[in-house]
Interface confidence: medium
């Protein structure tokens, strides 16, 4: 394991550094210039540094589990799981789920009562006694109810000519009831009777564009319990149709752009405001399946049968049967779902922060095995047989205490996981003994925490009324830069520099900004080698004899002395035995300067004052022009012919020295004035 | 600015052993290097051995085994054991240190002692 640390002072840091953190408690573990981090690491490397094993601080993530022996019929186990969890380490349980016999069921028909499914209907009146005794041979406690829809009673779902809204159907003579989006007819019961009653008053009623508003109204019996009666047990919506269905975005063609707000919207058993709102998205009415624990079965007939199946990829906990055209077989269809139902089991969580983290691994009763899943998945699961799940949760940081939920979806049953920080280092200190702390402070975890107005590794620094920040302000470079070069502890307001675990390698610097080894290398060797030189704040310091950045040169000027034996003829300087020429003066010697500009116009005050003792400079001369020398004799050198203050022509030569700005001159005795007109 | 104390030389025969100290004092922030040069008559200045800052020593091949150089931090002090002394030991040894200024940013400057006869006679 690593342990990866940034900046930790504290036990409680290392530990939520990651999982392969651990903290050393022992006294005086960490030397002058040590950090306090030192004390976090793994804990091969803290024993190997010399901490004890009962020293080091090493919280690991637990679960404690709870049975609850109250209340009726208990599928699940246990109820209530309570996990301490260290950031990074999961804390694992397992979940047993033993399916029950004879699990309450309530079931509600949904139908589609579009004019073609007519004969369908007529069917159905005579289904509830089918229906009920069907359920009584898998509970104990049945019960059935009824809804149905059509569609939103806009255009272009419904025809909106008023003769068309009384009677929606093709045939005129047919008696139709007028189209509607959502009809709540019963609320779940178990009198076969009233079933029979109510769904025989049924009038087929009927649209005109194919798909139908079926997932308005499955969100209506997700999003309205009371109304619906479901009781907390097996809840089942069969869904009946013969075509597709309106979802997000549909609502838009007739004009409805309020996106559906997943409430109970029942209004006299009427889904009344359907024209108000858009139809589910298909991942919301998920969701609120899931969320009610209700399990829907698609009864839809052949032509429709793969487009439910595609809807049950989506929704959890589904099943698809295909229904006979005029829905004879749909007792038989139901009983089938019901079996493929409920012989699968999801378990899975309710939404979770970003700071958790689920998983599932599976151990199926038919010996099959899923590992690492985001939920748990078992077929075939046999009535009595136990499946065990095991459940692995991690926390990313040191979490708030929370609870959360875990159910097998379409069962009542829940485990309440309660989730507590394991971030807590109970150290063995000598709490009260504050003579380690100067008595300014008291131990915790093997270093002080100094009491206000005092800071420190024993609290020896007293802040005399500047705030740690003032403090901490004279052990930064600048605002940008971090203490100490984050090198370094900063006591009080100065840097005291990490020593350093690399060999040869020291930092120091008033910010701990230096070390010794980070310098360019010669001849494979930090600066040469030690004998050549040193690194110090990454630049390398030459013993005398040695120059060069990485000291690689001996120091010797034979290269750069030009015939006079002048180092770079006095202008540039001898490095590495190559002349570095001050600017425009040219390799090798600096004699020549090209692209200089003319020294004439810059002299001839100084060709005056120098040989005919006259103009500005006439009076101070040699102060004026300390770099010239008067030569009696011509010289070689630039030539130059320049108006003096008297407007007369000098003509001089300049031979350039050595060294800057140094001539001798050499000035014609004659110099030409012309006569202003009289 | 530094200043650079030396003791220990001598007059000492062969097969003997001496040993020098140099002190350094003045606006020091921190002593990068101490050591000795040393320059036989009629030769170019060598050096000897230095000690680094982190207690890193180095010997010139000349000395290797012979000679021990060792520092006390706090007294700004170095010292130059010389054992199983030669002849050609003889020459007068300077004593070196390498020092940051205090106020001179981060540049180093290099301070020479006086210098310490050490004769060696056969």
């Known amino acids: 394991q690593e342990c990866t640390k940034f900046k930790v002072s504290s036990c409680r840091e290392c530990i939520e550094s990651g999982p392969g953190c651990t903290w050393c408690q022992k006294l005086n573990f960490t030397g002058p210039g040590d950090p306090d981090s030192i004390r976090c690491d793994t804990r091969p490397q803290l024993l190997m540094r010399g901490c004890a094993a009962d020293d080091i601080m090493d919280p690991t993530s637990l679960a404690e589990t709870q049975e609850d022996h109250n209340g009726g019929q208990k599928q699940l186990s246990p109820q209530k799981v309570t996990l301490y969890l260290r950031p990074g380490q999961a804390a694992a349980f397992n979940v047993t789920f033993r399916r029950a016999k004879g699990y309450p069921i309530d079931l509600y028909y949904l139908m589609d009562l579009s004019y073609s499914m007519l004969d369908d209907l007529r069917n159905v009146k005579k289904l509830g006694g089918d229906l009920l005794r069907a359920l009584n041979e898998i509970t104990e406690s049945g019960r059935i109810g009824f809804g149905s829809f059509v569609d939103k009673t806009v255009l272009p779902f419904v025809n909106t000519h008023p003769d068309k809204l009384r009677n929606p159907c093709p045939n005129k003579e047919k008696e139709c009831q007028p189209p509607f989006a959502f009809r709540h007819v019963l609320k779940l019961t178990n009198n076969s009777n009233q079933f029979q009653t109510e769904v025989g008053k049924q009038l087929i009623s009927g649209n005109l564009d194919a798909p139908e508003g079926g997932l308005d109204a499955m969100m209506q019996v997700a999003a309205c319990p009371e109304e619906i009666g479901w009781r907390n047990v097996t809840r089942l919506l069969v869904f009946a149709t013969d075509d597709g269905f309106h979802f997000a975005g549909d609502g838009k063609l007739g004009a409805i752009l309020t996106p559906n707000d997943g409430r109970c919207h029942l209004e006299d058993n009427l889904y009344k405001r359907s024209n108000e709102f858009d139809y589910p998205s298909v991942g919301q009415l998920a969701h609120k399946l899931a969320e009610n624990n209700i399990q829907p079965i698609f009864a839809v007939t052949s032509r429709m049968v793969k487009t439910y199946e595609k809807l049950t990829e989506i929704i959890p906990k589904s099943a698809v049967g295909e229904l006979s055209e005029d829905s004879s077989n749909v007792v038989h269809l139901i009983k089938n779902a019901y079996n493929k139902l409920s012989s699968r089991v999801f378990l899975d969580h309710n939404a979770l922060p970003d700071t958790l983290k689920v998983t599932y691994d599976s151990f199926c009763s038919n010996g099959v095995t899923h590992r690492n899943q985001p939920r748990g998945d078992c077929d075939g699961v046999q009535i009595n047989v136990p499946i065990t799940f095991q459940v692995k949760v991690t926390a990313t940081e040191c979490i708030q205490e929370q609870s959360f939920v875990i159910r097998a979806l379409g069962f009542t049953d829940i485990v309440t996981v309660q989730v507590l920080p394991q971030c807590e280092c109970r150290c063995r200190d000598q709490s009260r003994d504050r003579s380690l702390c100067h008595g300014k402070g008291f131990l915790e975890c093997g270093i002080c925490r100094c009491d206000t107005g005092y800071i420190g590794k024993n609290c020896e620094c007293q802040t005399q009324g500047r705030s740690s920040q003032e403090l901490e302000g004279s052990c930064r470079k600048d605002n940008n830069s971090i203490i100490c070069s984050g090198l370094g502890d900063c006591v009080c307001g100065q840097c005291l520099c990490h020593t350093s675990d690399v060999p040869g390698k020291l930092i120091y610097g008033q910010y701990c900004e230096c070390d010794t080894i980070n310098c360019e290398r010669y001849n494979g060797q930090v600066c040469g080698g030690p004998g050549r030189g040193l690194c110090f704040c990454g630049k390398c310091r030459c013993h005398p004899g040695f120059e060069g950045s990485a000291c690689q040169c001996e120091r010797t000027t034979e290269g750069c002395l030009n015939p006079r034996r002048v180092e770079c003829s006095g202008r540039g300087r001898c490095r590495c035995n190559v002349c570095e020429c001050h600017s425009g003066y040219q390799l090798p010697l600096c004699q020549e300067c090209p692209g200089c500009p003319s020294p004439c116009g810059k002299y001839i005050s100084c060709a005056e004052c120098l040989k005919f003792e006259k103009g500005p400079f006439g009076k101070n001369c040699s102060a004026a022009c300390p770099g010239l020398q008067l030569s009696n004799n011509p010289v070689k050198g630039r030539t130059c012919k320049e108006r003096d203050s008297e407007g007369c022509w000098v003509a001089y030569t300049l031979e350039q020295q050595d060294g800057m700005d140094r001539y001798l001159i050499y000035v014609d005795e004659s110099r030409e004035c012309v006569a202003g007109p009289n | 600015e530094v200043q650079l104390v030396e003791s220990g030389g001598g007059l000492v025969q062969t097969g003997g052993s001496l040993r020098l100290s140099c002190a350094a004092s003045?606006?020091?922030?921190?002593?990068?290097?101490m050591g000795w040069y040393r320059q036989a008559p009629g030769k170019q200045r060598e050096l000897v051995t230095t000690i680094i800052r982190d207690g890193k020593t180095y010997y010139s091949d000349s000395v290797k085994d012979r000679f021990t150089i060792s520092r006390d931090n706090a007294k700004n002090t170095a010292y130059l054991q010389m054992n199983s002394l030669k002849p050609e030991d003889t020459a007068v040894y300077y004593c070196y240190t390498k020092v940051i200024v205090m106020g001179a940013g981060m540049d180093d400057n290099d301070f020479f002692g006086q210098g310490t006869q050490v004769t060696v006679s056969s």
């Open positions: 003045g606006s020091i922030f921190m002593i990068l290097a």
